[in-house]
Structures are given as structure tokens and as C-alpha cells.
């Protein structure tokens, strides 16, 4: 059976750039070990944003540089990206595979469109 | 530019061993899958086996599973494919591939390199 | 295993046709499929990833859609660089499996 991951369709990003949504999949095996990868779709180019594997139970730990955190919660994985700003508007695809053991499985979501304001810089007071 | 350049095929007894080694340049391969896909003489692609470079984890098709041991040292930027117990039906045209991010797509192959399993 | 069956094994057409291929998954799978073209002594070139993505490059003549698990590649009008063996690919879930190839070739 194929892979289903949803995720939300539009996500407005805070005023401090920071953007979370859920990526949800149904895991057509009994994975132990997870990846999760987001991904940023533009112009037809494709990019990594961050990805982390985990095992099932265990908290999603992504690299200490990454712009990502996340949690994650039987099949569910809560992701938050940071430090967003407005050319950082564009589609973030969630990539699910499960990786171990055998046989692996993908999953790709439709991707989430996620809007980036800048603030408006605050007027100078004298 | 990416590149992937095959080597180490040749003519080989059955039941012997070849390693193939797959040198990839032009991007940081730690980030990528790389893939062993094969074509015999006149027929169709087939899928032998695929690495995770980030982390090893490995894949097989059942017609090489437990003879064939994919590798990967990401220090070199090259991926291997040992082959033993090799059988006349491994003869073929072996291509090492790179997985794309997205739908894990072959986006670069390497020119191929061929291997011939005879007596 | 999924099986990905692909229709037809070969065709002949003359420059600026229309072709379709036709591959047809043996049970569900995910939008990871994709299409590579290959030309005699060559690699495969990938065309299509994602069942309907157009792969940097190529001209957009090449088209992919999905419909279930049937997954379609179209040439809009053939040119005489195209004629060449055409192979569908899934990715959904190890072992990755291709079709067995539509030769095209010149009417």
C-alpha cells in the first residue's frame, strides 16, 4: 500500500518568522526508525530545509544548526521552522520515508504554502 | 557539474567476485541516496540496490540479496557494489545513479560500466 | 512486489504525433514515479519525477499525469530526437521497480 502524508494546505508564519504545521502519514508498515524531510518547492527547484530521523517513541531530534524543531507523536510529526523571512514564501513539501526494517517506504505530502510578512520596522521615537 | 563515473567491470568466472566503484563529484553526497541499477544486453532497467549516504541504511532487490553488498564512504565521495557469487545472469550494464530529493528520482546516472559473468 | 506494467512495448510514429505511454501500477503507490528516456549505448535521462514534475531541461513537450495507478507520459508533438526507449520508475517502496520499456520508434 502507498503512503499517505497530509499536511496543511496554507500556513501564515508569525510576525517573528516562525511557521508550524502538522505532517501526518499512514504507515503502511511497522517502521522502527522514521525520517521525516522538509522540503521547499520553487521555480521548479527542489531543496532540503532539514530532515531528522527518529525512532518510533522517541523525540524527532534534528541537526543542532537546523531551522527546524519538531515532536512527534505515533504518526503524527508537529513541525515548527524559524528565522523565516518574506523571500522564504513558497511551498514546504513534508517527505515521510520509513527507513527500518525493510521494506522502505515513501510518502510525500502536497506541501504546505507558507506566507512570510516582514514586520514593518517600528518608527523611531524621540 | 554532477558526475558519476563507474569502474571496475570486466569478464568474471561464475561464482567469482567484482567490486564496483561509483565516484560521484559536484555535490555534497552525504545529502543524496545513490543507486546500483543494471540492463542486460537487450532488455529492460533493473534496480540492484540503493545506500542512504547520510546514514548506510541499504536496500536490495531479492535476485542479489545476501551476494551483493552496497557501500558507501562518504569521505571519498564514492559508493561501491560488491558482487559475489556471481551468476550468468548478472551479466549486464551496471549504472550507479543519484536519488533526487523529491519522489526519490534518478536525476544523474554515470555512464555505465559493464560486467560479464562467463566461463 | 509492485509490478509496473507498461503499454505499449513499442510504437511507431512519425515526427510531430502525438504519443502517450501508459504505466499501470500493480497496487497503490505513492506520486513517486517518474520517466527516464534512453537512447541506444546511453544512460537513461531523467524526464519526469513525481508522476507529473517536469525535470529541469527537459522540454515541455513532455508532459506526465496520474490517474490512480495509472500513470501516463505524454509527447505532445514528437520530434526526431525523441524517438528513443521509454521507462516508467516507482519509488513508493523498495524494491523500486521499472517498467519494461516503450521502444518508439520512426513510422
Known amino acids: 500500500k502507498a503512503m499517505h502524508v497530509a499536511q496543511p494546505a496554507v500556513v501564515l508564519a508569525s510576525s517573528r518568522g516562525i511557521a508550524s504545521f502538522v505532517c501526518e502519514y499512514a504507515s503502511p508498515g511497522k517502521a522502527t526508525e522514521v525520517r521525516v524531510t522538509v522540503l521547499r518547492q520553487a521555480d521548479s527547484q527542489v531543496t532540503e530545509v532539514c530532515a531528522a530521523t527518529y525512532m518510533m517513541g522517541n523525540e524527532l531530534t534534528f541537526l543542532d544548526d537546523s531551522i527546524c524543531t519538531g515532536t512527534s507523536s505515533g504518526n503524527q510529526v508537529n513541525l515548527t521552522i524559524q528565522g523565516l523571512r518574506a523571500m522564504d514564501t513558497g511551498l514546504y513539501i513534508c517527505k515521510v520515508e520509513l527507513m527500518y526494517p525493510p521494506p522502505y517506504y515513501l510518502g510525500i505530502g502536497n506541501g504546505t504554502q507558507i506566507y512570510v510578512i516582514d514586520p514593518e520596522p517600528c518608527p523611531d521615537s524621540d | 557539474e554532477v558526475q558519476l563515473v563507474e569502474s571496475g567491470g570486466g569478464l568474471v568466472q561464475p561464482g567469482g567476485s567484482l567490486r564496483l566503484s561509483c565516484a560521484a563529484s559536484g555535490f555534497t553526497f552525504s545529502g543524496y541516496w545513490i543507486h546500483w541499477v543494471r540492463q542486460a544486453p537487450g532488455k529492460g532497467l533493473e534496480w540492484v540496490a540503493a545506500i542512504t549516504s547520510r546514514d548506510s541504511y541499504t536496500y536490495y532487490a531479492d535476485s542479489v540479496k545476501g551476494r551483493f553488498t552496497i557501500s558507501a564512504d562518504t569521505s571519498k565521495n564514492t559508493a561501491y557494489l560488491q558482487m559475489n557469487s556471481l551468476r550468468a545472469e548478472d551479466t549486464a550494464v551496471y549504472y550507479c545513479a543519484r536519488g533526487s530529493y523529491l519522489g526519490s528520482a534518478f536525476d544523474y546516472w554515470g555512464q555505465g560500466t559493464l560486467v560479464t559473468v562467463s566461463s | 512486489d509492485i509490478q509496473m506494467t507498461q503499454s505499449p512495448s513499442s510504437l511507431s510514429a512519425s515526427v510531430g504525433d502525438r504519443v502517450t505511454i501508459t504505466c499501470r501500477a500493480s497496487q497503490s503507490v505513492s506520486s513517486a514515479v517518474a520517466w527516464y528516456q534512453q537512447k541506444p549505448g546511453k544512460a537513461p535521462k531523467l524526464l519526469i519525477y513525481s508522476a507529473s514534475s517536469l525535470y529541469s531541461g527537459v522540454p515541455s513537450r513532455f508532459s506526465g499525469s496520474r490517474s490512480g495507478t495509472d500513470f501516463t507520459l505524454t509527447i505532445s508533438s514528437l520530434q526526431p530526437e525523441d524517438f528513443a526507449t521509454y521507462y516508467c520508475?516507482?519509488?513508493?517502496?523498495?524494491?523500486?521497480?521499472f517498467g519494461q520499456g516503450t521502444k518508439v520508434e520512426i513510422k
Open positions: 520508475q516507482q519509488s513508493s517502496t523498495t524494491p523500486f521497480t
